[in-house]
């Protein structure tokens, strides 16, 4: 017999989501307008393509990457789309209110949509740690809190540390990872007897997760270069990211084989490790002066990712209740930190080279930025976790974790769909 949504959630979710959507529509009506300038149509299309790449990464890439659970693949993809759609709307408004509102209405440009998509991507990275253990109503809360926290973090970093769009958005990796891990820490952890099979991966969902990884792999250069100010910086970012992810694929596959006693390749390792280089070069992708450095970074990132995938899941499963296949959280937390450290190393090398105390001051500022990102991520994540534990949301019972049938109508209720 089919498992239905609890009656209270059936009332709560549509009401909650549609009320929120109506509120967003009203906010857009009163406070936003489009950029009225006449622009070069070719330029407009080129600019839109960057945003399109980001949307593909978010909707298909991250959507499918998280779909490897045997009994939770539908929910992973669709819930990701739901969160992306909601997150982009709220992020556009929030960014506008925080950055331009004092001057009147919020002007919506392709750039603001680009920024909003990247902000929403943060939620999709974080949610990997909790997907399967929460319902849509809870995910709405998570979207609102995380986008708000990230938006405020970016504004604070921009105003206090005077960081440009690219640098303050590249904290997204560390922020999203720690946010997701701290939310997961707050949620009920133990998987009851009889549900262990649900958080296992299956062949077809794993293939779709690989498809997601491929989309992310293809478009990662767009993500790392999207917010850079000059063509030369974007060109460097695209090249360096491409070299880094190329090497991390080779490292992921060979490293995964090396890590296995029989030399077999783990799907889970490969899903995340192929992206390792892109995350690791993110912060300094436009600054790396030659391909070989980006390639070395890709190699190191791939090894860290495979090593992390081998040794960290046990710890994460015990402490945070994160299933073995949801390794994006700790993967991004390690690789995001690596990326930030690379940038700090570049600053230190500048200090040594220039003998300039000011660049030393920049090192302290960068460490301050990183620390602030981690602190805000942990605090807002814990707050979200506490909110998600409220009875009002009617969270799925632990026995219903990682189960599409709780949320979806299937014409035939065969267990092995």
């Amino acid at each position: 017999m089919s498992s239905k949504y609890p009656r209270s959630v059936r009332r709560c979710l549509p009401l909650w989501a549609l009320t929120l959507e109506a509120a967003l529509i009203l906010l857009f009506y009163f406070f936003t307008h489009y950029d009225a300038s006449l622009e070069d149509q070719k330029g407009l299309v080129a600019s839109y393509q960057v945003g399109q790449d980001l949307t593909v990464m978010a909707a298909i890439g991250l959507g499918f990457l998280t779909s490897s659970f045997r009994r939770h693949s539908w929910s992973s993809v669709a819930f990701n789309l739901f969160m992306l759609a909601l997150g982009v709307q709220w992020a556009i408004l929030l960014d506008g209110f925080l950055s331009q509102f004092p001057s009147g209405k919020v002007v919506i440009t392709l750039f603001s949509i680009r920024l909003a998509t990247m902000s929403a991507l943060s939620v999709l990275i974080s949610v990997d740690a909790v997907l399967g253990k929460v319902n849509l109503a809870q995910l709405v809360v998570m979207v609102l809190v995380e986008v708000t926290a990230l938006g405020n973090l970016r504004m604070v970093i921009s105003n206090i540390f005077n960081t440009d769009y690219h640098m303050n958005m590249m904290h997204i990796y560390v922020f999203a990872a720690y946010f997701g891990l701290s939310v997961a820490w707050c949620l009920p952890k133990p998987l009851p007897e009889g549900t262990e099979d649900k958080d296992q991966t299956a062949t077809i969902p794993s293939l779709s997760a690989m498809l997601g990884a491929l989309f992310l792999w293809m478009f990662w250069p767009s993500f790392n270069s999207a917010l850079l100010r000059s063509p030369i910086e974007r060109k460097n970012a695209v090249f360096n990211t491409y070299y880094a992810v190329a090497v991390s694929v080779v490292t992921a596959i060979s490293g995964s084989s090396l890590a296995h006693p029989q030399g077999k390749i783990s799907k889970t390792y490969v899903h995340s490790a192929v992206l390792a280089g892109g995350v690791a070069v993110g912060t300094s992708c436009h600054l790396i002066p030659s391909p070989w450095l980006a390639m070395v970074l890709g190699l190191v990132a791939g090894l860290i990712s495979v090593g992390g995938a081998k040794y960290l899941p046990g710890c994460c499963n015990r402490v945070l209740g994160i299933p073995h296949s949801s390794i994006m959280g700790y993967n991004f937390s390690l690789l995001g930190l690596l990326g930030e450290i690379i940038y700090i190393v570049l600053l230190v090398l500048d200090t040594v080279g220039a003998g300039n105390g000011m660049i030393g001051f920049q090192v302290l500022l960068s460490i301050g930025e990183l620390s602030l990102a981690i602190v805000i991520a942990l605090m807002s994540g814990l707050l979200t976790g506490l909110l998600l534990n409220l009875k009002i949301w009617k969270a799925p019972h632990e026995a219903k974790y990682f189960d599409d049938q709780v949320f979806w109508k299937f014409p035939h209720l065969a267990v092995g769909f």
Partner: antibody, heavy 126, light 106 residues
């Protein structure tokens, strides 16, 4: 030689509109961010607006926000400044300037205005 | 960051060593540029990133400083150097200019 040529200036009444153009020659406009800078008679330089190389992002000086709009048509190698609701204090010579960038150190790019137009005069008077 | 320049004007003779200072209201690292403007002409970039000489600019022009205090030095003033000099920060938006220093003949 790399050049920027402004046009569209003139005498206009307060509250009216004017559109300035800046045509680039001997270089591809798409490769550069572009600024508008103005200079009131007998005064110093004042930055007005900036647009990214692909037109995706724009910045304005507070006093012109909501009244001025910077745009570009990269296929025509031309930059524009649409000025609405003009005020007497907008009277100035308006320059367009190309943004150059260079990676001087390992960890940063530096930005500067390396090519300037000859300027076009805008007089707002009743 | 707001910029102030000193002196606002100075008189000097050909061959003199001239120093113009620019102070920022907050630290701008090395994100400072210097421009020269002659009457009726458009500005011309001299120095970027506080101390890097723009190509085609004579080596008698040099820049130094970081943080909040910067200096433009003309080692031996030439007749064509009589002009107004502006500093400009590119550290934050808006990329503000200093009020200018007018260098004229003594």
């Amino acid at each position: 030689e790399v050049q920027l040529l402004e046009s569209g200036g003139g005498v206009v009444q307060p509250g009216r509109s004017l559109r300035l153009s800046c045509e680039a020659s001997k270089f591809t406009l798409y490769n550069y961010g572009m600024h508008w800078v103005r200079q009131a008679p007998g005064k110093g330089l004042e930055w007005v607006a900036f647009i990214w190389f692909d037109g995706s992002n724009k910045y304005y000086e507070d006093s012109v926000k909501g009244r001025f709009t910077v745009s570009r048509d990269n296929s025509k190698n031309t930059l524009y400044l649409q000025m609405n609701s003009l005020r007497a204090e907008d009277t100035a010579v308006y320059y367009c300037a190309r943004e150059g960038s260079k990676k001087v150190a390992l960890s940063r790019y530096y930005y500067y205005m390396d090519v300037w137009g000859q300027g076009t005069t805008v007089t707002v008077s009743s | 960051a707001e910029l102030t320049q000193s002196p606002s004007s100075l008189s000097a003779s050909v061959g003199d060593r001239v120093t113009i200072t620019c102070r920022a209201s907050q630290s701008i690292s090395s994100y400072l540029n210097w421009y020269q403007q002659k009457p009726g002409k458009s500005p011309k970039l001299l120095i970027y990133a506080a101390s890097s000489l723009q190509s085609g600019v004579p080596s008698r022009f040099s820049g130094s400083g970081s943080g909040t205090d910067f200096t433009l030095t003309i080692s031996s003033l030439q007749p064509e150097d009589f002009a107004t000099y502006y500093c400009q920060q590119s550290y934050s938006t808006p990329p503000a200019f200093g009020p200018g220093t007018k260098v004229d003949i003594k």
